[in-house]
Amino acid sequence: QQQTLPKPFIWAEPHFMVPKEKQVTICCQGNYGAVEYQLHFEGSLFAVDRPKPPERINKVKFYIPDMNSRMAGQYSCIYRVGELWSEPSNLLDLVVTEMYDTPTLSVHPGPEVISGEKVTFYCRLDTATSMFLLLKEGRSSHVQRGYGKVQAEFPLGPVTTAHRGTYRCFGSYNNHAWSFPSEPVKLLVTGDIENTSLAPEDPTFPADTWGTYLLTTETGLQKDHALWDHTAQNLLR
């Protein structure tokens, strides 16, 4: 019986959300000794890389210099060691942002609330879209999808300090083409709570993270990036 190699990791650097006309690199990490990597886009072969020397390289990069809506979609990669191919990677949803318009994000009852208070975000965009996405900065990349003619509601329910952080929203023209990001809304959750165990505050990226959707590229964080992206994309799907 023909065996297959473990699937590779796939992720985008600096981020899977790419402003139009900006560059992005799709990374595929397989095994040392892999002689060929293939990148597939929407099910078809998109690019091939043959690392040299293969025994010293376990990762390849596919560079996209100018992001646009035609390049946005689902990517996967595979690699080959000898005649043996790997399982395909998870799907990477590459999203083009800064398309068309900018939504407005607001939060009720306000940006500062008491622990346990019910909070709802509202994302509004007057142009033709019916899908909206709410994202919270931080490696766990909380993504919610909402629908509405010009506005979507995102009820967070009773909040805890784990909900603290900076939120932005996007209008989505399709799964892979998003609007400009809204202005950020910082949610502050205060409250002295007796005998209540709360989740810790979510780690967040530096303040400039969202200007260009950059993730901090620290050594050893590549797999975190892949998981971060994958978590968000699963929620998108």
Partner: antibody
């Protein structure tokens, strides 16, 4: 319909404490925070603090911190505001108000007079 | 804390005329600004929420505008029952703060 009914007027000595109640009806008590706002005679409105009844989270105006305690009893849909170490300048009407974004419903007010 | 400043302190207007009340925040509060009306011996009543959103049961002559630091409450044609004290409130940050009030009196 939403109603907030407060306890009756109180006359207190300086240095003592007062506890005012606010019974809510007409909505799910735990789904909204309850706040306390006071108004001294001839003066404006002053926020004292609020509570989230579902988990007991509170937020206080630093001006009152240490003297004010806000609690809630979900079983009776009642919020309480206790103010200690009373002084003459605490003479005021005390209101409870539901925060439904803004303060959309208010109690009728409780007059607390601090006098020796 | 965010300081809310209302002007004028007292506004004298005749019934049927238009009244414009101002409220300024010491820092930007976006549209997290609410307006209340209070009559003697009564609790405050919500008039406008989030700077411009109308409230069910409140007459259409009451409207609000503004964003950031400067806000306005407009009463298009004053009725006798509109003479009262009006307060704006910061709903953005704790401590939640109120303006000192504008007394609307009959001219």
């Amino acid at each position: 319909q939403v109603q907030l009914v407060q306890s009756g007027a109180e006359v207190k000595k300086p240095g003592s404490s007062v506890k005012v109640s606010c019974k809510a009806s007409g909505y799910t008590f735990s789904e909204y925070t309850m706040h306390w706002v006071r108004q001294a005679p001839g003066q404006g409105l002053e926020w004292m603090g609020g509570i989230s009844p579902n988990i007991g989270g509170t937020s206080y105006n630093q001006k009152f911190k240490g003297r004010v305690t806000i609690t809630a009893d979900k079983s009776t849909s009642t919020a309480y505001m206790e103010l200690s170490s009373l002084r003459s300048e605490d003479t005021a009407v005390y209101y409870c108000a539901r925060r439904g974004g803004s303060f959309d419903y208010w109690g009728q007010g409780t007059t607390v007079t601090v006098s020796s | 804390e965010i300081v809310m400043t209302q002007s004028p302190a007292t506004l004298s207007v005749s019934p049927g005329e238009r009244a414009t009340l101002s409220c300024r925040a010491s820092q930007s509060i976006s549209d997290y600004l609410h307006w209340y009306q209070q009559k003697p011996g009564q609790a405050p009543r919500l008039l406008i929420k989030y700077a411009s959103q109308s409230i069910s049961g409140i007459p259409a002559r009451f409207s609000g505008s503004g964003s950031g630091t400067d806000f306005t409450l407009t009463i298009s044609s004053l009725e006798p029952e509109d003479f009262a004290v009006y307060y704006c409130q910061n709903g953005h940050s704790f401590p939640l703060t109120f303006g000192q009030g504008t007394k609307l009196e009959i001219k």
